[in-house]
Interface confidence: low
C-alpha cells in the first residue's frame, strides 16, 4: 500500500469562453481508495479555490460555470490526490480561457446536388455554426474545413472554406454515393469535431470539372 | 516590440479619395482585429470599423459604411483604410489600433492627420 | 448602439486629491459576468493610452494610482493620488458589442 501516483491534467477546454471544464488522468492509486481534488488561483491572487463542480464534465473533472469563467485572467490550477497513505499533487497548469475554446460542431449541413443549364454541375453544401458561438460581436471569428469522400474510399478530401458557410465543390466521381462532414475552429483556439456525416449520391451524368 | 506605423498628415482636395496605411510589426498581424479610430480637432473618439486580417472580415459602424472600406495587404502586415468622397468633415486624426482578444485596443498608431482642403 | 455618457465633462483637482470620473452606459455593458467597459488617457498630439479594461484591471505598466470600478451600467475612473502628470482627457469606451463606442471624454486639469 501505497501513497497515490502523480495525477496529470491533460486538457481543458471551453465551447464558447464562457463556461470550461478540465480533465486530469489519476495516477497509481496505491491499493487504496483515494480521493481527488482541483484546487486554482487566478493569476495575480493567492486566494485558493476548491473546483466547483465535480459533476457535469465526468469523472476526473472540473467543470467551470458562467459564474467561475474569467476571460481577463490566466488560471493556475492543480489536482490533489490523497489515500490513507499521503498525497501527490500535480503539476500546476495555466489556463487561458481565450486559447482552449472548442466549440461544438457546425450545424444543420445540407448538400445538394447543383446541375445548372449553362455551368458545369457542382456539388453545394451549406451549414450554420454553432448555437453557443456569438458571431455577432466580433467575439469569435469562426473557419470552416469540410471533408467529403466516396463512401466506400479510404482517403478524406479536405477543402478550407473560411468564414463561408456555404461551398461549392466541382470535382466528384459521378455515380458514386459521397459522406460530407464540416468542423470549425476560432481563431486562438481547438477544431470541433466533425459534424455528422451527411450522405448524397452523385448522379451518374454528373460531369467531371476538366 | 509592438508597433503600428501610420504617415504623418495627408492632404486631399474636395471630392477626392484617400488611402491610409498602417504598417504593423512586432506581432502575428492575422491574429488580431485591427480597428480604426477618427478624432476631429478638440473632439472625441469615434469608431468607424475593424477588418480582421486572417480572414478579411469586417464590421463598420453604421454612419461610416459608405464612408470608409478596410483592407490589409498581409504579405506587408499593413491595413488600409480608404475614404471616398472627401468633406471638410472628413479632416480629422485617423487611428489605428490592434484590439487585444480581450476585446480592448492595447496598441495605437500615432495618427495621421488628414486635411480636405482646396 | 450603446451610448456612453461621461461627467463632468471638465474637473479640476488639487494635486494629491482624489479624481473620480463616471460613464454610463445606455445598456449594460455585461456579459458572462464581465463588464467589457474600458478607461483611455489622451494627451495632446499623443494616441490614446490604454489605462483600465474590464471595468477594473489596469493595463500594462499603468501605475496603481488608477482604478475602475463599476457593473452593468454605471462605472468609475478614481485617480489617487492626482499627480501633475495626470493632466489629460479621459474616454471610457465598451467592447461589448459592434459598434464600439466611446464616451464624450472628460478633461483633467490642475487646480
Known amino acids: 500500500q501505497l501513497p497515490p501516483g502523480k495525477p496529470e491534467i491533460f486538457k481543458c477546454r471551453s465551447p464558447n469562453k464562457e463556461t470550461f471544464t478540465c480533465w486530469w488522468r489519476p495516477g497509481t492509486d496505491g491499493g487504496l481508495p483515494t480521493n481527488y481534488s482541483l484546487t486554482y488561483h487566478r493569476e495575480g491572487e493567492t486566494l485558493m479555490h476548491e473546483c466547483p463542480d465535480y459533476i457535469t464534465g465526468g469523472p476526473n473533472s472540473c467543470h467551470f460555470g458562467k459564474q467561475y469563467t474569467s476571460m481577463w485572467r490566466t488560471y493556475i490550477m492543480m489536482v490533489n490526490a490523497t489515500n490513507q497513505m499521503g498525497s501527490s499533487f500535480s503539476d500546476e497548469l495555466y489556463v487561458d480561457v481565450t486559447y482552449i475554446v472548442q466549440p461544438d460542431p457546425p450545424l444543420e449541413l445540407a448538400v445538394e446536388v447543383k446541375q445548372p443549364e449553362d455551368r458545369k454541375p457542382y456539388l453545394w453544401i451549406k451549414w450554420s455554426p454553432p448555437t453557443l458561438i456569438d458571431l455577432k460581436t466580433g467575439w469569435f471569428t469562426l473557419l470552416y474545413e469540410i471533408r467529403l469522400k466516396p463512401e466506400k474510399a479510404a482517403e478524406w478530401e479536405i477543402h478550407f472554406a473560411g468564414q463561408q458557410t456555404e461551398f461549392k465543390i466541382l470535382s466528384l466521381h459521378p455515380g458514386q454515393k459521397y459522406l460530407v462532414q464540416v468542423r470549425c475552429k476560432p481563431d486562438h483556439g481547438y477544431w470541433s469535431a466533425w459534424s455528422p456525416a451527411t450522405f448524397i449520391q452523385i448522379p451518374s451524368d454528373f460531369t467531371m470539372n476538366d | 516590440q509592438v508597433q503600428l506605423q501610420q504617415p504623418g498628415s495627408e492632404l486631399v482636395r474636395p471630392g477626392a479619395s484617400v488611402k491610409l496605411s498602417c504598417k504593423a510589426s512586432?506581432?502575428?498581424?492575422?491574429?488580431?482585429?485591427m480597428h480604426w479610430v477618427k478624432q476631429r480637432p478638440g473632439q472625441g473618439l469615434e469608431w468607424i470599423g475593424n477588418?480582421?486580417?486572417?480572414?478579411?472580415?469586417?464590421n463598420y459602424d453604421e454612419k461610416f459604411k459608405s464612408k470608409a472600406t478596410l483592407t490589409v495587404d498581409t504579405s506587408s502586415s499593413t491595413a488600409y483604410m480608404q475614404l471616398s468622397s472627401l468633406t471638410s468633415e472628413d479632416s480629422a486624426v485617423y487611428y489605428c489600433?490592434?484590439?487585444?482578444?480581450?476585446?480592448?485596443?492595447?496598441?495605437w498608431g500615432q495618427g495621421t492627420t488628414l486635411t480636405v482642403s482646396s | 448602439d450603446i451610448v456612453l455618457t461621461q461627467s463632468p465633462a471638465s474637473l479640476a483637482v488639487s494635486l494629491g486629491q482624489r479624481a473620480t470620473i463616471s460613464c454610463r452606459a445606455s445598456?449594460?455593458?455585461?456579459?458572462?459576468?464581465?463588464?467589457?467597459m474600458n478607461w483611455f488617457q489622451q494627451k495632446p498630439g499623443q494616441p490614446p493610452k490604454l489605462l483600465i479594461y474590464?471595468?477594473?484591471n489596469r493595463g500594462s505598466g499603468v501605475p496603481a494610482r488608477f482604478s475602475g470600478s463599476g457593473s452593468g451600467t454605471d462605472f468609475s475612473l478614481n485617480i489617487h493620488p492626482m499627480e501633475e502628470d495626470d493632466t489629460a482627457m479621459y474616454f471610457c469606451?465598451?467592447?461589448?458589442?459592434?459598434?464600439?463606442?466611446f464616451g464624450g471624454g472628460t478633461k483633467l486639469e490642475i487646480k
Open positions: 512586432g506581432y502575428t498581424f492575422t491574429s488580431y482585429w
Open positions: 445598456e449594460s455593458v455585461d456579459k458572462s459576468g464581465f463588464s467589457f
Open positions: 474590464a471595468a477594473s
Open positions: 477588418i480582421y486580417p486572417g480572414s478579411g472580415s469586417t
Open positions: 469606451q465598451q467592447s461589448k458589442e459592434v459598434p464600439w463606442t
Open positions: 489600433t490592434r484590439g487585444n482578444y480581450r476585446y480592448y485596443f492595447d496598441y
